[in-house]
Interface confidence: low
C-alpha cells in the first residue's frame, strides 16, 4: 500500500493586509478515513485554525467541498488577513478514533502579512530658533507590519546621526508605529534647507517613503544693521542710510527716530530674496541740516519677527554748516517713492 502523502506545495505565501490568503493542501489518498485539520505552529502549543470535521471558523472557508467523498483537496482560504495571522500553517491528516490520531503533517506553509507604513509626517518646532541653536524634528508613520523597519534622517541630502527612534508596541501586535526625533543644529545658511525622514519597509519594494520639513519654518536669521551718512548735498540735505541685511523671515518693521522722536515707520514687503533665502532692505532719511541748531541723533530701529527691537544710532554734525533763517523743518522726505531702496546684494 502506498504511503499517505500530505502535500503543501508552497513553502511560503505573502499576503497584503486585508486580502485573502489561500493555503493549499492535497492528500495522496483518502485511506484511512479521518479528518484533516489546519494548525498554526507545531508542537503541543499549536493553534487549531480549521477543522473540516466540526467547529465554526468564520474567517476560514474550504476551497473545495470537503464533504465530497472523492475530494482530495483540503486547501483553505483565510479572509481579511491581518498581521496577527502571520505564522507557519500545517495541514494535518488524522485517523478517525477516540481521540483522532495524527497520521501525517504537511511540510508547512509560512504566511507572512504585509501592511504598508503610512506616509511619514514630519513636524518641526513650534517656535523659530536662531543659528547655532538645536531644534527637534519629529517623524511619525503608522500601521505597518512586519515590525522591522528602517528610518533615516537627511539634511540637504546628508544623513543625520543625532536622532532617537522608537517602534511601538514592543511586543507582538496587529500593526506597528514608528516615531523618531532628530536634533538639527541651525546655521544662518539654512533658510533653504530641508530635513527628510525616510522610511524603508519590506512592503515598499525598495522605494522608501519620505516626509519633509523646511527649515524655513523653524529658523530666524536676525538682521545686521549699518547706518551711514552720504555726502552733503548742495541743498544742505544729508542722506542717512540704514542698511538691514541678511534677515529671515521677511516680517520686519523699521522706524526712524530723530533725537528720540519717531520720524517714520515702514514695513518690509515684497522684498527680493538673496541666494541664501535671506532678505536685505535699505531705507534712507533726508535730513535738512540748515533746520537744526544742534547735532541730530538719528536712530534706525528694527523690529524683526516679533523680537525685541534692535537700534543703531548715528549723529549728524550740523555745527559746521550755515543755518538757514526762518526754517522750522526738522526733517524732510523726498517722496514715498524714495523712502526705500531695495538692496540687491546676494
Amino acid at each position: 500500500e502506498e504511503e499517505l502523502q500530505v502535500i503543501q506545495p508552497e513553502k511560503s505565501v505573502s499576503v497584503a493586509a486585508g486580502d485573502s490568503a489561500t493555503l493549499n493542501c492535497t492528500v495522496s489518498s483518502l485511506i484511512p478515513v479521518g479528518p484533516i485539520q489546519w494548525f498554526r505552529g507545531a508542537g503541543p502549543g499549536r493553534e487549531l485554525i480549521y477543522n473540516l470535521k466540526e467547529g465554526h471558523f468564520p474567517r476560514v472557508t474550504p476551497v473545495s467541498d470537503p464533504t465530497k467523498r472523492n475530494n482530495m483537496d483540503f486547501s483553505i482560504r483565510i479572509s481579511n488577513i491581518t498581521p496577527a495571522d502571520a505564522g507557519t500553517y500545517y495541514c494535518v491528516k488524522f485517523r478517525k478514533g477516540s481521540p483522532d490520531v495524527e497520521l501525517k503533517s504537511g511540510a508547512g506553509t509560512e504566511l507572512s502579512v504585509r501592511a504598508k507604513p503610512s506616509a511619514p509626517v514630519v513636524s518641526g518646532p513650534a517656535v523659530r530658533a536662531t543659528a547655532e541653536h538645536t531644534v527637534s524634528f519629529t517623524c511619525e508613520s503608522h500601521g505597518f507590519s512586519p515590525r522591522d523597519i528602517t528610518l533615516k534622517w537627511f539634511k540637504n541630502g546628508n544623513e543625520l546621526s543625532d536622532f532617537q527612534t522608537n517602534v511601538d508596541p514592543a511586543g507582538k501586535s496587529v500593526s506597528y508605529s514608528i516615531r523618531s526625533t532628530a536634533r538639527v543644529v541651525l546655521t544662518r545658511r539654512d533658510v533653504h534647507s530641508q530635513v527628510i525622514c525616510e522610511v524603508a519597509h519590506v512592503t515598499l519594494q525598495g522605494d522608501p517613503l519620505r516626509g519633509t520639513a523646511n527649515l524655513s519654518e523653524a529658523i530666524r536669521v536676525p538682521p545686521f544693521l549699518e547706518v551711514t551718512q552720504q555726502s552733503m548735498r548742495a541743498d544742505n540735505q544729508v542722506n542717512v542710510t540704514c542698511q538691514v541685511t541678511k534677515f529671515y523671515p521677511q516680517r520686519l518693521q523699521l522706524t526712524w527716530l530723530e533725537n528720540g522722536n519717531v520720524s517714520r515707520t515702514e514695513m518690509a514687503s515684497a522684498l527680493p530674496e538673496n541666494k541664501d533665502g535671506t532678505y536685505n532692505w535699505t531705507s534712507w532719511l533726508l535730513v535738512n541740516v540748515s533746520a537744526h541748531r544742534d547735532d541730530v541723533k538719528l536712530t534706525c530701529q528694527v523690529e524683526h519677527d516679533g523680537q525685541p527691537a534692535v537700534n543703531k544710532s548715528f549723529s549728524v554734525k550740523v555745527s559746521a554748516h550755515p543755518k538757514e533763517q526762518g526754517s522750522n523743518t526738522a526733517a524732510e522726505n523726498t517722496g514715498t517713492n524714495e523712502r526705500n531702496i531695495y538692496g540687491g546684494s546676494g
Epitope: 503541543p44 493553534e47 468564520p58 491581518t82 511586543g171 496587529v174
Partner: antibody, heavy 118, light 107 residues
Framework: EVQLVESGGGLVQPGGSLRLSCAAS????????MHWVRQAPGKGLEWVSA???????YYTGSVKGRFTISRENAKNSLYLQMNSLRAADTAVYYC????????????WGQGTMVTVSS | DIQMTQSPSSLSASVGDRVTITCRAS??????LAWFQQKPGKAPKSLIY???SLHSGVPSKFSGSGSGTDFTLTISSLQPEDFATYYC?????????FGQGTKLEIK
C-alpha cells in the same frame, strides 16, 4: 461536559496572599489560551491575566508584579497566585477559556469571591 | 490600552421590542469584538465573537455587526429572560478590555 470550576477565594487582609484554582473538565486546558477576569461588587468586568498555549503570560497593569498566572497540565488546572493584595482587588474572579480560533472567550466558570479587608 | 465605550449605559424596553446596543473602540480592532450577557449573581455568558458569529446554543434573535471601531448588538424580539446587563469586549490585543456595560431593564 465542558466546565470550569474556580476555588480558593475568601477573606484576606491587605498585603496578604491568596491562590485561586480553576479545574477544567471536558477539554484539555493546555490546548487553549486561558484567562482570569474579575468583577468588583456592583462594577463591570475587568480582564486580569492570560496564559497562552506556549506558556506566555499577560497581565493588566494594576496587577503586574503582584499576580502570577500558571497552569498544571497534569491536573488540567489553571492558577492565579495573588500577592500584596489591596482593597481594590476585592472582586469575583472568573476563570475563562479562550476560543481555539481567535481567543474569543467561550466558557466561563461560576466565579470565586475574593475580599481584601482588614 | 484600547478603550471600549458602550451606549446607552441603561435602556428600558418592553417585551417584544427590538433593541440595539452600540460599542465603540478607541482604535481599529478589525472584527475582534465579543458580546456577553450577565444576569445578577451569575457568571457572564458568551453570546457573540468576531463581531457577528454566534456561540453555540445562542438563539438567533441575537445578532452582531460592525468592523473597525463601531459595533452593534441587536436583540430582535425581547423576551423576559433577555433583561440583563450586556458587555462588549475587544480581544485584538492585550490588555483585553470591556465596555462599561449596558443595563437592559423592563419598561
Amino acid at each position: 461536559e465542558v466546565q470550569l470550576v474556580e476555588s480558593g477565594g475568601g477573606l484576606v487582609q491587605p498585603g496578604g496572599s491568596l491562590r485561586l484554582s480553576c479545574a477544567a473538565s471536558g477539554f484539555t486546558l493546555s490546548s487553549y489560551d486561558m484567562h482570569w477576569v474579575r468583577q468588583a461588587p456592583g462594577k463591570g468586568l475587568e480582564w486580569v491575566s492570560a496564559i497562552g498555549t506556549a506558556g506566555d503570560t499577560y497581565y493588566t497593569g494594576s496587577v503586574k508584579g503582584r499576580f502570577t498566572i500558571s497552569r498544571e497540565n497534569a491536573k488540567n488546572s489553571l492558577y492565579l497566585q495573588m500577592n500584596s493584595l489591596r482593597a481594590a482587588d476585592t472582586a469575583v474572579y472568573y476563570c475563562v477559556r479562550g476560543g481555539v480560533w481567535d481567543d474569543a472567550f467561550d466558557i466561563w466558570g461560576q466565579g470565586t469571591m475574593v475580599t481584601v479587608s482588614s | 490600552d484600547i478603550q471600549m465605550t458602550q451606549s446607552p449605559s441603561s435602556l428600558s424596553a418592553s417585551v417584544g421590542d427590538r433593541v440595539t446596543i452600540t460599542c465603540r473602540a478607541s482604535q481599529d480592532i478589525n472584527n475582534y469584538l465579543a458580546w456577553f450577557q450577565q444576569k445578577p449573581g451569575k457568571a457572564p455568558k458568551s453570546l457573540i465573537y468576531t463581531a457577528s458569529s454566534l456561540h453555540s446554543g445562542v438563539p438567533s434573535k441575537f445578532s452582531g455587526s460592525g468592523s473597525g471601531t463601531d459595533f452593534t448588538l441587536t436583540i430582535s424580539s425581547l423576551q423576559p429572560e433577555d433583561f440583563a446587563t450586556y458587555y462588549c469586549q475587544q480581544y485584538v490585543s492585550y490588555p483585553y478590555t470591556f465596555g462599561q456595560g449596558t443595563k437592559l431593564e423592563i419598561k
